[in-house]
Interface confidence: medium
């Protein structure tokens, strides 16, 4: 999916108002310095591409993020503010439902969510000065 046409300001608002808090809740008890950020992005469409990948694509050692509160809110924000996004996700969602539910917060998942926090911060990168 090409995220170029998303309403970035609305997604930013969704992140600030709720997704950021859910990410913090998920990471509670973990020191902010525990994981190094190894994933980055260089503009907002690129960030959303990386955020979608880390949030919804199962990875070795962490297959359970898609059911987390921050993930569901991320999906809702993308569906609402990115034209045509929800249509591209129908097959992926159906495949996800077939997966066994398993609520285990592994260290790998914590590391992955730490990367997500970094990507969201990059997406939301504050303009230090009005230029």
């Amino acid at each position: 999916y090409d995220f170029t046409n998303c309403d970035f300001e609305k997604i930013k608002a969704a992140y600030l108002s709720t997704i950021s808090k859910d990410l913090i809740t998920y990471m509670s008890g973990t020191k902010s310095t525990e994981f190094n950020n190894t994933v980055s992005c260089s503009n907002r469409p690129h960030c959303l591409t990386e955020i979608q990948s880390l949030t919804f694509n199962p990875t070795a050692g962490c297959a359970s993020l898609a059911k987390e509160m921050f993930a569901m809110k991320t999906k809702a924000a993308l569906a609402i503010w990115c034209p045509g996004y929800s249509e591209t996700q129908i097959n992926a969602t159906q495949a996800m439902k077939k997966r066994r539910k398993r609520k285990v917060t592994t260290n790998k998942c914590l590391e992955q969510v730490s990367q997500l926090q970094g990507l969201w911060r990059r997406f939301n990168r504050p303009l230090l000065k009005q230029q």
Partner: antibody, heavy 122, light 108 residues
């Protein structure tokens, strides 16, 4: 590793044309704004042109406007600078430069090529 | 068009602190970046967004920006810091990148 490699420099007569190319590798080229910056022998840095990550916008220094054209091919990870009506004052090392693109073009240049020399002389 | 003014040269003894200034009208309202260039080499980013530092750059390099002056500070200067230093901003009124004229840092 991440790198930018310029090519196409050389000696050219005033009024003639030259096309510079820059091959990018090791990073997501299509997500970065790309610039050309030049440096005349013994002089400081002079910005030449920028093209946005998706090619939707270009801006040029007043000194090259109407003569130079910046283009990119994201499918081939290449940046180009078509230089027409060259003048002696265009003689310089031309650097291909990468910049993350968040808010228009206010970002820093975080990756530079090694440069290619262009000499305009009769 | 927007103009950035740097001193042509700054000299400092090893171990001392070097301060290189970059003047511009209300530059404090812009994001300033600094580059180091050694002879025969391409420039390298040393400070971005006024005061942030790329991970590979030593902590000795720092930046500040307010009013009409941005400053690059190099503490505990080493011989290897000898180079030309350039400040840079994006001028939104003209949609142009603007560089300062450069400052040659000499380590005595």
């Amino acid at each position: 590793q991440m790198q930018l490699v310029e090519s196409g420099g050389g000696v050219v007569q005033p009024g003639r044309s030259l096309r510079l190319s820059c091959a990018a590798s090791g990073f997501a080229f299509r997500t970065y704004g790309m610039h050309w910056v030049r440096q005349a022998p013994g002089k400081g840095l002079e910005w030449v042109a920028v093209i946005w990550y998706d090619g939707s916008n270009t801006h040029y220094a007043d000194s090259v406007k109407g003569r130079f054209t910046i283009t990119r091919d994201n499918s081939k990870n290449t940046l180009n600078l078509q230089m027409n009506s060259l003048r002696a004052e265009d003689t310089a090392v031309y650097y291909c430069v990468r910049a993350p693109q968040w808010y228009l073009s206010a970002e820093a240049f975080d990756l530079w090529g090694q440069g290619t020399m262009v000499t305009v002389s009769s | 068009s927007y103009v950035l003014t740097q001193p042509p040269s700054v000299s400092v003894a090893p171990g001392q602190t070097a301060r290189i200034t970059c003047g511009g009208n209300l530059i404090g309202a812009k994001l300033v970046h600094w580059y180091q260039q050694k002879p025969g080499q391409a420039p390298v980013l040393v400070v971005y967004d006024d005061s942030d530092r790329p991970s590979r750059i030593p902590e000795r390099f720092s930046g500040s920006n307010s009013g009409n002056t941005a400053t690059l500070t190099i503490s505990r200067v080493e011989a290897g810091d000898e180079a030309d230093y350039y400040c840079q901003v994006w001028d939104h009124s003209s949609d142009h990148v603007v560089f300062g004229g450069g400052t040659k840092l000499t380590v005595l």
